[in-house]
């Protein structure tokens, strides 16, 4: 995240952390059911470990942490490279969280977001750009979703429905790291953290999520199916 | 400004293994995202990629070469090289190296474009 | 393994002309294509990235667009120092990273 600040503890209690080993954030992950997490497609690795319920990248031991293995990882069928559509996958934890007030699912939202809309994108992804400065603790950005026009404006031919724009001010964007994490609107998932310009954070270069609202009836299905 | 130097030797004999270094200076290879490529170019011929390695030392070889290749960085030296072994003299060429500026950030992330390249250094593969 | 196919492979042309190149993918790259000048005896030079992006330093004569599967890059006024062979790079999500084969542009 460029130019965020620390979350407030405890309040992204549904933000998860996918990590290869030793203890090597790649990505984030969203806690969408008890046993279950959303993250970008793109995200995708054999062999992984989730932490949710943690607040600082590093592994020391915070009370509040649970960790898992992802045992089931199941991409969007629809999902594409060079595209980059439909950019989501569900993992099936080893077991079911225990529910904390650090570790809690989030609902997915069934509306689409309109323009405007005020949100938060949440990461351990790297502050700065290109440089590499990953933060001591989860990042927090308030940004706001961006018409549909302005979004393939900035992106020409690379937008479709299943992804939106949102952004603030040139400077702040999310960026490498925090792929496959939360934004929330109005208290509900809205998107994941899909792609965007490089450097992060350029002017007109808003960053570019996976729409959820569109998704809803395949991750209700998945889960079903796979539990 | 960031420059790259290739070094290492300019013959090599068949069946050995071809070793070159890339020096980076003006800047450091371990504080930005970037990937660090190897190219080669024979006689009178286009560009081949090699190879590449990323910030987080992950390694992407063509599959062409994939078991001859191995790349690697050396961040307390500020360079990384190229191993390629059992050369023959199709292996003959110039070699670049050169500096992989990702095109986005995310799913965006493994497309890049090369926007500093050293000048090149003429391995000939003979006994 | 997605094959870049550039055309032609050599062109002459005049100082003024307006010049252009053409690269085709053998499956749909986005917009994930970059093109590069090489003078004889030189390292490559990138000129476009993400197939329209012009690289900083580089004149604004020259220009790049498509999409999908093809793509085009132009000299509006060709210049003495653009006389060298340009070349298009794709940079897929799996390996290999491929060259198109060049084009020579030449003195008429």
């Known amino acids: 995240i460029i130019n965020g600040s620390d979350c407030d503890m405890h309040t992204q209690p549904w933000q998860a952390a996918l990590l290869l080993r030793p203890n090597q954030l790649y990505c984030g992950a969203v806690l969408v059911h008890p046993q279950w997490l959303l993250t970008a497609a793109h995200c995708r690795k054999k062999v992984f470990r989730v932490r949710l319920g943690h607040y600082s990248l590093s592994p020391v031991y915070e009370s509040g942490q649970q960790m898992f293995q992802g045992v089931k990882s199941i991409p969007h069928p629809g999902y594409s490279h060079p595209g980059h559509s439909n950019d989501l996958m569900l993992i099936k934890l080893n077991r079911r969280i225990r529910p904390t007030k650090d570790v809690r699912p989030i609902n997915v939202s069934s509306h689409c977001p309109s323009a405007g809309t005020k949100c938060l994108v949440s990461g351990w992804g790297t502050t700065k750009s290109p440089q590499v400065h990953f933060p001591k603790v989860l990042q927090c950005l308030n940004i706001s979703v961006l018409s549909q026009k302005r979004c393939e404006d900035a992106y020409p031919r690379q937008i479709d429905d299943t992804m939106f724009c949102a952004g603030d001010k040139a400077g702040r964007d999310s960026c490498q790291g925090d792929s496959g994490g939360p934004v929330v609107c109005n208290g509900s998932l809205q998107g994941l953290v899909s792609w965007g310009d490089y450097p992060c954070a350029r002017p007109n270069r808003p960053g570019v999520y996976t729409n959820l609202c569109k998704f809803t009836k395949w991750i209700q299905e998945t889960i079903q199916a796979n539990s | 400004q960031l420059q790259l130097q290739e070094s290492g030797p300019g013959l090599v004999k068949p069946s050995e293994t071809l070793s070159l270094t890339c020096t980076v200076s003006g800047g450091s290879i371990s504080s930005d995202d970037y990937y660090w490529v190897w190219i080669r170019q024979p006689p009178g011929k286009g560009l081949e990629w090699i190879g590449s390695?990323?910030?987080?030392?992950?390694?992407y070889y063509s599959p062409s070469l994939k078991s001859r290749v191995t790349i690697s960085v050396d961040t307390s030296k500020n360079q990384f090289s190229l191993k390629l072994s059992s050369v023959t003299a199709a292996d003959t060429a110039v070699y670049y190296c050169?500096?992989?500026?990702?095109?986005?950030?995310?799913?965006?992330?493994?497309?890049?474009?090369?926007?500093?390249w050293g000048q090149g250094t003429t391995v000939t593969v003979s006994s | 393994d997605i094959q870049m196919t550039q055309s032609p492979s050599s062109l002459s042309a005049s100082v003024g002309d307006r010049v252009t190149i053409t690269c085709r993918a053998s499956?749909?790259?986005?917009?994930?294509l970059n093109w590069y000048q090489q003078k004889p005896g030189k390292a490559p030079k990138l000129l476009i990235y993400?197939?329209?992006s012009l690289q900083s330093g580089v004149p604004s004569r020259f220009s790049g667009s498509g999409s999908g599967t093809d793509f085009t890059l132009t000299i509006s006024s060709l210049q003495p120092e653009d006389f060298a062979t340009y070349y298009c790079?794709?940079?897929?999500?799996?390996?290999?990273?491929?060259f198109g084969g060049g084009t020579k542009v030449e003195i008429k």
């Open positions: 993400s197939a329209s």
């Open positions: 390695i990323d910030y987080y030392a992950s390694t």
């Open positions: 499956q749909s790259i986005s917009s994930y």
């Open positions: 790079q794709q940079s897929p999500y799996f390996p290999p990273l491929t």
């Open positions: 050169a500096r992989g500026r990702p095109l986005g950030y995310g799913a965006k992330h493994y497309y890049y474009g090369m926007d500093v």
